[in-house]
Interface confidence: low
């Protein structure tokens, strides 16, 4: 039975041109994490494999950095980066856990004068 839960940074916002950390945490389970996939809508961004380490999809190598931990850092943000991001934890023996984060990338002026800009 899958007893674990995924905690995420939830809905976050960041400034255009800046960077943001996407973070998920799997708790309430003793299952072994074998791999974590990070996806944006239907596109694979990165994999963190327990044996082989990190690999960033070639299409995103210019703006995606691994870590901290099992998280993912997005750099040089554009408005087009707004949307849903998923952390997919592959575990044994539980199976797959998925967490969702919604990122809104704001124009600099909006971020500077609004309360929604956060650094997690």
């Amino acid at each position: 039975m899958m007893t674990g839960t995924i905690e995420t940074t939830g809905n976050i916002s960041a400034e255009k041109g800046g960077s943001i950390i996407l973070q998920c945490h799997l708790s309430s389970t003793t299952a072994q994490v074998t791999q974590v996939n990070w996806e944006q809508q239907d596109q694979l961004l990165a994999i963190c494999n327990a044996d082989l380490g990190w690999h960033i999809s070639p299409s995103f190598k210019d703006r995606v950095a691994p870590g901290p931990g099992l998280g993912l850092t997005l750099q040089s943000l554009t408005v087009n980066d707004t949307g849903e991001y998923f952390c997919i934890y592959h575990t044994y023996p539980d199976g797959t856990y998925t967490g969702r984060i919604f990122l809104e990338v704001l124009e600099s002026s909006v971020a500077e004068h609004g309360a929604r800009f956060q650094i997690p």
Partner: antibody
């Protein structure tokens, strides 16, 4: 529309040199990794080298078969990719393709190394 | 370097039939696998990336599967325009490497 056009192929004697070019358009050249891949007549594809994008310092990687003889470079102001080939051998005869990250390829240019 | 092995150099299949092309990596490549189609005199065309993701404009009769070291390209309802050579490529580890190709013919 993404467009890649290779040029510069031809007949070269063993030991000679040649520079291939790949003119690109339809995308922000600085932002993408670029590669060269070759294919000898009737044979399989062979990945040769890549040059990373601006964010990754335009660093380069090579396969063992061409390391030290071939040099990949890019002119970011003109959006052109180059492959400088030195000490050419008969086994370098092939169609040479430039490719952009994301699966875009040119139509290729042919190199023949023969005396 | 990671070696990519396509066990079948040639496959002959009936029109409308189904074909499976296999590719095995010498080490784990974590789904960092692409499939290309190449017709004589043309540049390769990317069909599938990430082992399973169909590229835009590629007919749905093409599909990719696999994990770890073993990957498969499947074509259902084979059409005459599918006659080509198919290559797998790993892009998990530099140097990126291609399989030797599988030439598909109509029976």
């Amino acid at each position: 529309e993404v467009n890649l056009v290779e040029s510069g192929g031809g007949l070269v004697q063993p030991g000679g040199s040649l520079r291939l070019s790949c003119a690109t358009s339809g995308f922000t050249f600085n932002d993408y990794y670029m590669s060269w891949v070759r294919q000898p007549p009737g044979k399989a594809l062979e990945w040769l080298c890549l040059i990373r994008n601006k964010a990754n310092g335009y660093t380069t990687e090579y396969s063992a078969s061409v390391k030290g003889r071939f040099t990949i470079s890019r002119d970011n102001s003109q959006s052109i990719l180059y492959l400088q080939m030195n000490t050419l051998r008969a086994e370098d005869s092939a169609t040479y393709y430039c490719a952009r990250d994301g699966g875009y390829w040119g139509q290729g240019t042919t190199l023949t190394v023969s005396s | 370097d990671i070696q990519m092995t396509q066990s079948s150099s040639y496959l002959s299949v009936s029109l409308g039939g189904r074909v499976t092309i296999t590719c095995r990596a010498s080490d784990h490549i974590n789904n960092w696998l692409a499939w290309y189609q190449q017709k004589p005199g043309n540049a390769p065309r990317l069909l599938i990336s990430g082992a399973t993701s169909l590229e835009t404009g590629v007919p749905s009769r093409f599909s990719g599967s696999g994990s770890g070291k073993d990957y498969t390209l499947s074509i259902t309802s084979l059409q005459t325009e599918d006659v080509a050579t198919y290559y797998c490529q790993q892009y998990w580890s530099i140097p990126f490497t291609f399989g030797s190709g599988t030439k598909l013919e109509i029976k």
